[in-house]
């Protein structure tokens, strides 16, 4: 059935589009109250599973620029600076929402899209498969 | 100035709103071709900086459910299972886009919002401040 707006001040929606196409205000509200909430800009170097950041730009996407993590080593860095290959550096991935211009190049029409991004790396104990 | 649509098939936009309010198709396109793209569902247990996942639900937000990581220890887990407090477990955080219903309770009107989420944890060497 067609949803009944719960608030009389809501924008109207045509039945054929509803609820697939919505109006979105791009004036981003930032919920991060702290002035410097992340404090993680140097973790990529200090981690036992360090990573490099790669720039991915797509003007048809919002956000256009995403920095992706790529683990530097297969193993993990020990206290002496050497790599321990008995452990594994693995990417921590997250599915995020982005807006994709649709039709292409349109400044004011988008479609929601889910993409998988690597945010950083962590050091894990490998899964050992024992052969009988 | 008012942007000229780059594609004659673009929806119109009123000057007063443009380019802040846009049309978004909520029919999500998933760019992740793999059936199990994350492959990181057990990293939270196997990591030397393990984390727990906490469910955060907000019906006024899209997506309404977000899982947040909380590091289990201040230190990092050694091979023998004990915690090494000379190292630090730290959250890897990422700013992500969500849609916030605006006005509240409206089914088809949203505002973009940036929120900071903890995706997982990594083990880092601490910054030591030497006192003169």
């Amino acid at each position: 059935g067609i949803a009944i707006p719960r608030n009389s001040g809501c924008p109207n929606s045509e039945d054929k589009n509803f609820p697939r196409t919505v109006m979105v205000n791009l004036n981003i509200h930032n919920r991060n109250t702290s002035t410097n909430p992340k404090r993680s800009s140097d973790y990529y170097n200090r981690s036992t599973s360090p990573w490099n950041l790669h720039r991915n730009e797509d003007p048809e996407r919002y956000p256009s620029v995403i920095w992706e993590a790529k683990c530097r080593h297969l193993g993990c860095v020990k206290a002496d600076g050497n790599v321990d290959y008995h452990m594994n550096s693995v990417p921590i991935q997250q599915e995020i929402l982005v807006l994709r211009r649709e039709p292409r190049h349109c400044p004011n029409s988008f479609r929601l899209e889910k993409i998988l991004v690597s945010v950083g790396c962590t050091c894990v104990t490998p899964i050992v498969h024992h052969v009988a | 100035g008012i942007a000229i649509p780059r594609n004659s098939g673009c929806p119109n936009s009123e000057d007063k709103n443009f380019p802040r309010t846009v049309m978004v198709n909520l029919n999500i396109h998933n760019r992740n071709t793999s059936t199990n793209p994350k492959r990181s569902s057990d990293y939270y247990n196997r990591s030397t900086s393990p984390w727990n996942l906490h469910r955060n639900e907000d019906p006024e937000r899209y997506p309404s459910v977000i899982w947040e990581a909380k590091c289990r220890h201040l230190g990092c887990v050694k091979a023998d299972g004990n915690v090494d407090y000379h190292m630090n477990s730290v959250p890897i955080q990422q700013e992500i886009l969500v849609l916030r219903r605006e006005p509240r309770h409206c089914p088809n009107s949203f505002r973009l919002e940036k929120i900071l989420v903890s995706v997982g944890c990594t083990c880092v060497t601490p910054i030591v401040h030497h006192v003169a």
Epitope: S41, L53, R55, V65, P107 | -
Partner: antibody, heavy 121, light 107 residues
Framework: EVQLVQSGAEVKKPGSSVKVSCKAS????????IHWVRQAPGQGLEWMGV????????FYNQKFDGRVTLTADESTSTAYMELSSLRSEDTAVYYC??????????????WGQGTTVTVSS | DIQMTQSPSSLSASVGDRVTITCRAS??????IDWFQQKPGKAPKRLIY???DLASGVPSRFSGSGSGTDYTLTISSLQPEDFATYYC?????????FGQGTKLEIK
């Protein structure tokens, strides 16, 4: 008001290094990357690289062969460009410019005033 | 690297003239281009972004068009303050490259 204010002119010897600063104000520093562009006397514009103050990510024009280092200090909203092993052909005006991570359509909308670097023995 | 070739490299025109500057990419894998105006001793100023769109505060006599490898900046009626050097910049392929510039002089 958005402003990018760069450090003053520098005169350097060949083989030395120079570090140019770019102090941002009037916007959220971490929402924008800082790109660096240079212009030799009477020449065109040359893109040098980009730094993301939020993640610490950097990407360089390989033409500079590892001589460029871009950094940022989030606490002071200041970006830095260091160029090492200077040679006479590095004599140029160096510009910083902000670039929105959210919308490429808002790229390079504000520029610093430029810093003249002269390399001479 | 993608080369951006601007033509002409310089041109003379009079106030009121219609002027067109073109920018050609060495390959077609760019996403869009920006146009900048630069006056002597000043930083570049963005005129057109995303190939077509007028930057804030830029007069409507400036317009941009193009796709693929060929792009154009048009000034419909030259004004005295428009005499400057113009640069295109490609976005979408690293490194982001600028054209060599077109110097617009008073005839």
């Amino acid at each position: 008001e958005v402003q990018l204010v760069q450090s003053g002119a520098e005169v350097k010897k060949p083989g030395s290094s120079v570090k140019v600063s770019c102090k941002a104000s009037g916007y959220t520093f971490t929402d924008y990357e800082i790109h660096w562009v240079r212009q030799a006397p009477g020449q065109g514009l040359e893109w040098m690289g980009v730094n993301d103050p939020e993640s610490g990510g950097t990407f360089y024009n390989q033409k500079f062969d590892g001589r460029v280092t871009l950094t940022a200090d989030e606490s002071t909203s200041t970006a830095y460009m260091e160029l090492s092993s200077l040679r006479s052909e590095d004599t140029a005006v160096y510009y910083c410019t902000r670039y929105s991570k959210w919308d490429s359509f808002d790229g390079m909308d504000y520029w610093g005033q430029g810093t003249t670097v002269t390399v001479s023995s | 690297d993608i080369q951006m070739t601007q033509s002409p490299s310089s041109l003379s025109a009079s106030v009121g003239d219609r002027v067109t500057i073109t920018c050609r990419a060495s390959s077609g894998i760019i996403s869009y281009i920006d146009w900048f105006q630069q006056k002597p001793g000043k930083a570049p100023k963005r005129l057109i972004y995303a190939t077509f769109d007028l930057a804030s505060g830029v007069p409507s006599r400036f317009s941009g068009s193009g796709s693929g490898t060929d792009y154009t900046l048009t000034i419909s009626s030259l004004q005295p303050e428009d005499f400057a050097t113009y640069y295109c910049r490609q976005v979408g392929s690293y490194p982001e490259t600028f054209g060599q510039g077109t110097k617009l002089e008073i005839k």
